[in-house]
Interface confidence: low
């Protein structure tokens, strides 16, 4: 449906508040280093222009595409060359190449200062003084640090952020009210960002077909009572929404997401019985709720899969006629019967089925050839089941911190070339799978664990892509989206790695460690652990445990000392010497 003015169309659909918020997010995700005030100025200019187009769609420039309008605006930034270097070359290009160029320069790990949370009273004063600026600043700071954050969902986070301040800044104990809410938003926000990053990587690196396959499997698990045609329609619409958001088309994305939520709620009878509560909520909450809704109950009378996909004489005929539709139906039928499987496992099974049909439908006796295809699924199903069982046992034995340390050692030995901060961040997140998923009953463990691991390993992949240092990481990240986790699991110690030279400075600590939060202190210790493994990749678990126990005792002792700095200096030297001896460094 063509509109004379796209910008007027989106302004009218979204309303001024959401329009301004989404343009701010889009600009901050593109120009991640620009000061807040510069972005606000650009957004206000775009908004004023949009209003002139709403008044008269035939006005000058109102017929231009959003990419043209936004790109032209971004290219007016005076310090583009100094701040962004070669990204300024994007401005010499025409659309759509210019937008593609901006997208390629999005930085998953921008060199920005860590966000420090001010005192509660300071935050509440800022909130009351200028609520609008305070909330815009939140959008800006999150968007620039997470350039692929799902924009319509960020609006939902901002709404909750505002609600937290509105409630807590008038509470008797502001801090007790506010801080847990902010912690929850921070943790949920990081998880949401990482999940969306995987969706964008899936679309951008592996294509629409890969994303659609993921969506068919996930939606079929969630809506097992829905017809295949219904699931296919939802998949098509969902793919459009995520393609737009991942492509920087945030206004279109938010608009289409709202339409999809509306469609789902209008047709919930033919989709799922679990949608009723979600559909009574306002738009942002509704969309979020639908995205997180629990799986509907499976229909009671589902026939065996073998009849249509193995025993039927028409398997090869149906496959040849429309390969993707037939494979889509296989995936739909398998997924709706298996909410206990991870999406990536379901996709591995579908891939195995596809490979078998490709081979067998060209054979002399196709049926004979593919008759045992379901037997090939057994090892694929057992591999993640066994892995999760072993790792949950280890987690229950060690607790989260020590489980993270075990993974730190494991992954540093696999890919020691990866930077220490990345190894710490990724291994800490991998370790969180324990508290997140091991508490679940068997039927929910695999979808929780393996699909979460896919999200975390994608973080490793996108961070590594920025500065590639390991062929093994590149191989596991690029060969197959659904086999990333098995690929990393299969890696052994990298025998080609030349150990890092010992540097005492890396293991020198100061009294400032005593004032850190427990989490920050853990990160310091885990950073030291990674460095130890990089120096001594052949160190045994027992050796590493002994050194880490000594290190923990050293920190505890010096933090209790009267003259902390002297203690850290003197005892630190002894610790380094003892560690070198223990590890043979």
């Amino acid at each position: 449906d063509a509109h004379k003015s796209e910008v007027a169309h989106r302004f009218k659909d979204l309303g001024e508040e959401n329009f301004k918020a989404l343009v701010l997010i889009a600009f901050a995700q593109y120009l991640q280093q620009c000061p807040f005030e510069d972005h606000v100025k650009l957004v206000n200019e775009v908004t004023e222009f949009a209003k002139t187009c709403v008044a008269d769609e035939s006005a000058e420039n109102c017929d231009k595409s959003l990419h043209t309008l936004f790109g032209d605006k971004l290219c007016t930034v005076a310090t583009l060359r100094e701040t962004y270097g070669e990204m300024a070359d994007c401005c010499a290009k025409q659309e759509p190449e210019r937008n593609e160029c901006f997208l390629q320069h999005k930085d998953d790990n921008p060199n920005l200062p860590r966000l420090v949370r001010p005192e509660v009273d300071v935050m509440c004063t800022a909130f009351h003084d200028n609520e609008e600026t305070f909330l815009k600043k939140y959008l800006y700071e999150i968007a620039r640090r997470h350039p692929y954050f799902y924009a319509p969902e960020l609006l939902f986070f901002a709404k909750r952020y505002k609600a937290a301040f509105t409630e807590c800044c008038q509470a008797a104990d502001k801090a007790a009210c506010l801080l847990p809410k902010l912690d929850e938003l921070r943790d949920e926000g990081k998880a949401s960002s990482a999940k969306q990053r995987l969706k964008c990587a899936s679309l951008q690196k592996f294509g629409e077909r890969a994303f659609k396959a993921w969506a068919v499997a996930r939606l079929s698990q969630r809506f097992p009572k829905a017809e295949f045609a219904e699931v296919s329609k939802l998949v098509t619409d969902l793919t459009k929404v995520h393609t737009e958001c991942c492509h920087g088309d945030l206004l279109e994305c938010a608009d289409d997401r709202a339409d999809l939520a509306k469609y789902i709620c209008e047709n919930q009878d033919s989709i799922s019985s679990k949608l009723k509560e979600c559909c009574e909520k306002p738009l942002l909450e509704k969309s979020h709720c639908i995205a997180e809704v629990e799986n509907d109950e499976m229909p009671a009378d589902l026939p065996s899969l073998a009849a249509d996909f193995v025993e039927s004489k028409d398997v090869c005929k149906n496959y040849a006629e429309a390969k993707d539709v037939f494979l889509g139906m296989f995936l739909y039928e398998y997924a709706r019967r298996h909410p206990d499987y991870s999406v990536v496992l379901l996709l591995r099974l579908a891939k195995t089925y596809e490979t078998t049909l490709e081979k067998c439908c060209a054979a002399a006796d196709p049926h004979e050839c593919y008759a045992k295809v379901f037997d090939e699924f057994k090892p694929l199903v057992e591999e993640p089941q066994n892995l999760i069982k072993q790792n949950c046992e280890l987690f229950e034995q060690l607790g989260e911190y020590k489980f993270q340390n075990a993974l730190l050692v494991r992954y540093t030995k696999k890919v020691p070339q990866v930077s220490t901060p990345t190894l710490v961040e990724v291994s800490r997140n991998l370790g969180k799978v324990g508290s997140k998923c091991c508490k679940h009953p068997e039927a929910k463990r695999m979808p929780c664990a393996e699909d979460y691991l896919s999200v975390v390993l994608n973080q490793l992949c996108v961070l590594h892509e920025k500065t590639p240092v390991s062929d093994r990481v590149t191989k596991c990240c690029t060969e197959s989206l659904v086999n990333r986790r098995p690929c990393f699991s299969a890696l052994e110690v990298d025998e080609t790695y030349v150990p890092k030279e010992f540097n005492a400075e890396t293991f020198t600590f100061h009294a400032d460690i005593c004032t850190l939060s427990e989490k920050e202190r853990q990160i310091k210790k885990q950073t030291a652990l990674v460095e130890l493994v990089k120096h001594k990749p052949k160190a045994t678990k027992e050796q590493l445990k002994a050194v880490m126990d000594d290190f923990a005792a050293f920190v505890e002792k010096c933090c209790k000392a009267d003259d902390k700095e002297t203690c850290f200096a003197e005892e630190g030297k002894k610790l380094v010497a003892a560690s070198q001896a223990a590890l043979g460094l």
């Epitope: 449906d1 017809e227 219904e230 098509t236 469609y263 429309a322 993707d324």
Partner: nanobody
Framework: QVQLQESGGGLVQPGGSLRLTCTAS????????MSWVRQPPGKGLEWVSA????????NYADSVKGRFTISRDNTKKMLYLEMNSLKPEDTAVYHC???????SSQGTQVTVSS
């Protein structure tokens, strides 16, 4: 079970007309945009025309614009393609599909030849 059954194809002379019909069953037809796609001999699938669920939007490939008209009747669960001024290059198997998906139906053969 989703089923799409095309009919109305046949042999016609250049300049002639045909009306294709697609009968749908097994899904909520009135909720879905529908398309016609075709597969000329020895070639891949090509999109011909699409219509939104409520018939408010209709789109056509440049090669058929002004000659073909897409329409639907939601009460009867039927999709139509009116084809006028047919040319030899319109020869193909025509399929109706949900949205702009791949063809999973048998299709109906249209041959334009003198």
């Amino acid at each position: 079970q989703v089923q799409l059954q095309e009919s109305g194809g046949g042999l016609v002379q250049p300049g002639g007309s045909l009306r294709l019909t697609c009968t749908a069953s097994g899904f909520a037809f009135s909720n879905f945009g529908m398309s016609w796609v075709r597969q000329p001999p020895g070639k891949g699938l090509e999109w011909v025309s699409a219509i939104s669920a409520d018939s408010s939007t209709k789109n056509y490939a440049d090669s058929v614009k002004g000659r073909f008209t897409i329409s639907r009747d939601n009460t009867k669960k039927m999709l139509y393609l009116e084809m006028n001024s047919l040319k030899p290059e319109d020869t193909a198997v025509y399929h109706c599909v949900i949205g702009r998906g791949s063809a999973s139906s048998q299709g109906t053969q249209v041959t334009v030849s003198s």
